[in-house]
Interface confidence: low
């Protein structure tokens, strides 16, 4: 009952807890001398139904028995699962203004009997842990249901624990609080779960297990690694384990990897040698344990040990390239460039590079160390020079990589033929060529070199290059390739002591230029006009300019203009035209053309030639 119920009582038949689908009779009775004060016969008892504190029905029409002014019985059917509240109220019909007065109330719970618990599973975490079992309770009963977990074993061992499920909490797991020790390894234990509520009870089938079936070792702890003689590839992994562990599983991987290396170790006793580690690599190590070779369960993985293997001396060959520039009659500037080793070759933090330039015949040697990936020196133009570079970390240096310094474009016979550059997509350019026609020495390799054709690019930016074997005639260049930028691409053919090259321009994507060239001057010399211009600013070119066009027409003429098309050369900024009439005023302008189309016209200039016409 939910109220003090001073005015009367409410009872339920057959009970306040009923199975789903059953009906119930609710009787509301007034206590003696309670009711409407003046006319007891005007007492009217009404029954209200509430679900989740919300009034859902007045059961006036469900009255099955009535003692006027004293008690009423109502039949309720089709109750839904869960709890429903019924409140009986007294309505004094002669007093229309007063609301009905609560008499008493009752809660009816509708549910189902528990199903037999199934899928019992028991574990003991660690040798010192306690046995905990979980199970599947089956369908929700909607009633408070008590569960009893009972365990029995050898030597009259019995133990039980209880918990309950209701609408606030679910009971499908219990820790028995007892510890099974390894000396019971061969013994059999039986557990059973019994469920009981107001509508019935049920029991699981007995579940039988042994110590080894249920004990899950604690994960190994205190994991550490010792690198033998500070080796970067060999280390001894050590850990602490529970005393009964006979089998371990190790897994380890570089931190950026997606697949583990797995190792099984029998009777490792907390120690295992690893021999295939990568130097100077961040690794993650984890270990799992098992108490029996064939039976039992693996522990959870241990917490990770994360550590970096020590360095070892670099291996691999540096990729070297160079630029030669005469700066005087007897001096040249050599700029050496090289690519960083990849991590598996560097095997540590590269502290510096050892660079050597040597004149072969006179044995002149220039040596230096640098932290950069380039080095520039001025040397005599005479003699045969060779360069070598090696990379050093804290453990040592890589073997030097040698390259002969030759005149890269000095031998026309070694120049590759039919060089072409085609845009493949936004990010790369396909370069193809044919081998030199009459090379008097064998081509050892091709170098494809490229740089953006922008002011200062030679001095500001190192070149990009690819080494190509002598039997290949194509290269897909993608490093630092951006759309709408024109690149100068050189294909070098190198023999032992000579070099030849061919050059082409290319872009990965192009648009028509934003503007045309700006005519700066028109001058007349020997009956020819010289048109001078400034090049289109680099960002406005939007790819490789193929040619310029000079347009002219007589002022105020409506005729189509004439035009002269000039092959684009970066070094050229003037061009003669000779077909203009003297003493006629002309309007001139220029445009630029890429593979995508023609730019808008540049500025217009007027000019009136004075000399004779050709």
């Amino acid at each position: 009952n939910i109220d003090v119920c001073k005015l009367g009582t409410v009872t339920v038949q057959p009970a306040p807890v009923i199975p789903l689908g059953s009906a119930a009779n609710i009787s509301c009775s007034l206590n003696p001398k309670q009711g409407c004060s003046h006319y007891p016969s005007s007492n009217e008892l009404i029954l209200l139904k509430f679900v989740n504190d919300v009034l859902v029905e007045n059961l006036h029409g469900k009255k099955v028995h009535d003692h006027t002014g004293h008690s009423s019985t109502f039949q309720v059917t089709n109750l839904s699962l869960g709890m429903t509240l019924f409140v009986c109220k007294l309505n004094c019909s002669n007093s229309q203004k007063k609301p009905p007065v609560p008499v008493c109330g009752v809660e009816i719970s509708v549910g189902v009997a528990p199903e037999p618990p199934q899928n019992i599973s028991c574990v003991q975490e660690g040798e010192n842990g306690t046995v905990a079992c979980s199970w599947n309770s089956g369908k929700v009963t909607y009633l408070k249901t008590n569960y009893t977990l009972q365990l029995s074993g050898p030597n009259n061992l019995t133990c039980q624990k209880q918990c309950f499920s209701d609408n606030r909490q679910n009971c499908n797991r219990l820790d028995l609080g007892i510890n099974l020790s390894p000396d019971l390894a061969e013994s059999r234990f039986i557990v059973r779960v019994t469920a009981i509520n107001d509508l019935g009870n049920s029991s699981s089938l007995p579940h039988t297990f042994t110590f080894l079936d249920i004990v899950i070792p604690l994960p190994p702890w205190d994991i550490r690694i010792n690198f033998l003689n500070a080796s970067g590839s060999r280390g001894t992994l050590q850990w602490e384990d529970e005393g009964q562990v006979v089998l371990n599983q190790l897994r380890y991987q570089p931190l950026n990897s997606t697949s583990w290396n797995m190792v099984n170790a029998t009777n490792a006793k907390g120690k295992y040698d690893l021999r295939d580690l990568r130097p100077f690599t961040e690794y993650e190590f984890q270990i799992s344990s098992k108490l029996h070779l064939s039976g039992g369960s693996w522990s959870n993985w241990s917490e990770s040990l994360r550590t970096r293997t020590p360095e070892e001396e670099p291996v691999g060959i540096l990729d070297i390239w160079y630029m030669k520039q005469d700066i005087d009659y007897d001096r040249q500037q050599i700029s050496l460039f090289w690519k960083s080793l990849n991590p598996s070759e560097a095997r540590g933090k590269i502290l510096h590079y050892q660079v050597t330039l040597q004149e072969v015949t006179k044995k002149t040697t220039l040596q230096n160390t640098t932290r950069h990936t380039s080095w520039t020196r001025v040397i005599p133009r005479t003699g045969a020079w060779t360069a070598s570079v090696s990379a050093a970390n804290s453990k040592g240096a890589s073997a030097p990589t040698h390259i002969n310094i030759v005149d890269l474009c000095g031998t026309g016979l070694l120049a590759p033929h039919q060089v072409s550059a085609k845009s493949e997509n936004m990010d790369n350019i396909l370069v193809t060529w044919q081998p030199p026609k009459k090379a008097d020495s064998a081509v050892r390799e091709y170098i494809v070199e490229w740089r953006a054709l922008q002011p200062g690019s030679i001095t500001k930016f190192p070149p990009h290059w690819l080494r190509i074997p002598p039997d290949n005639m194509s290269a897909l260049i993608s490093e630092n390739i951006k759309p709408y930028i024109c690149y100068e691409i050189r294909v070098h053919a190198l023999s032992e002591s000579q070099g030849g090259c061919s050059s082409i321009r290319g872009d990965s994507k192009h648009k028509a230029p934003v503007s045309g060239p700006h005519i700066t001057a028109i001058t007349e010399k020997k009956e020819r006009l010289f048109i001078s211009w400034t090049h289109i600013p680099f960002p406005e070119q939007r790819g490789c300019i193929l040619h310029y066009r000079i347009y002219w027409k007589e002022r105020d003429s409506t005729a189509q203009p004439e035009l002269c098309e000039i092959q684009y050369r970066r070094s050229q900024n003037s061009h003669p035209i000779s077909s203009l009439q003297p003493r006629v005023t002309y309007v001139l302008w220029m445009t630029a053309v890429t593979a995508a189309g023609e730019s808008p016209q540049g500025n217009e200039r007027e000019f009136c030639p004075q000399g004779k016409a050709n």
């Epitope: 975490e125 010192n128 306690t130 905990a132 917490e303």
Partner: nanobody, 119 residues
Amino acid sequence: QVQLQESGGGLVQAGGSLRLSCTPSGRTFSTLAMGWFRQAPGKEREVVATISWSGGRTYYASSVKSRFTISRDNAKNTAYLQMNSLRPDDTAVYYCAARGTDYGAYDYWGQGTQVTVSS
């Protein structure tokens, strides 16, 4: 049977700090998962923070995240709850609890220690 003894509660001004300690006896401490719970007047007991047997896994209620830190020292057989930037709504009785496995129910409870945060 495990007994749990809390200490470190008291009265503190808002914004202040307290450090609660919990020492179990009766069982190897390093095999127990530990937790701190609290119950304010008229409210249900709620979890504050929990820590695994090894200390490798922790959990914090969203209301205390970044203000409270749970830790344990298996050598000293003690679990701690460091409470910083305390607020009046942190006022409650704080209970230490323990369980035999990382995944079980909390079987063992302390008597509680009062923490009062005044504004």
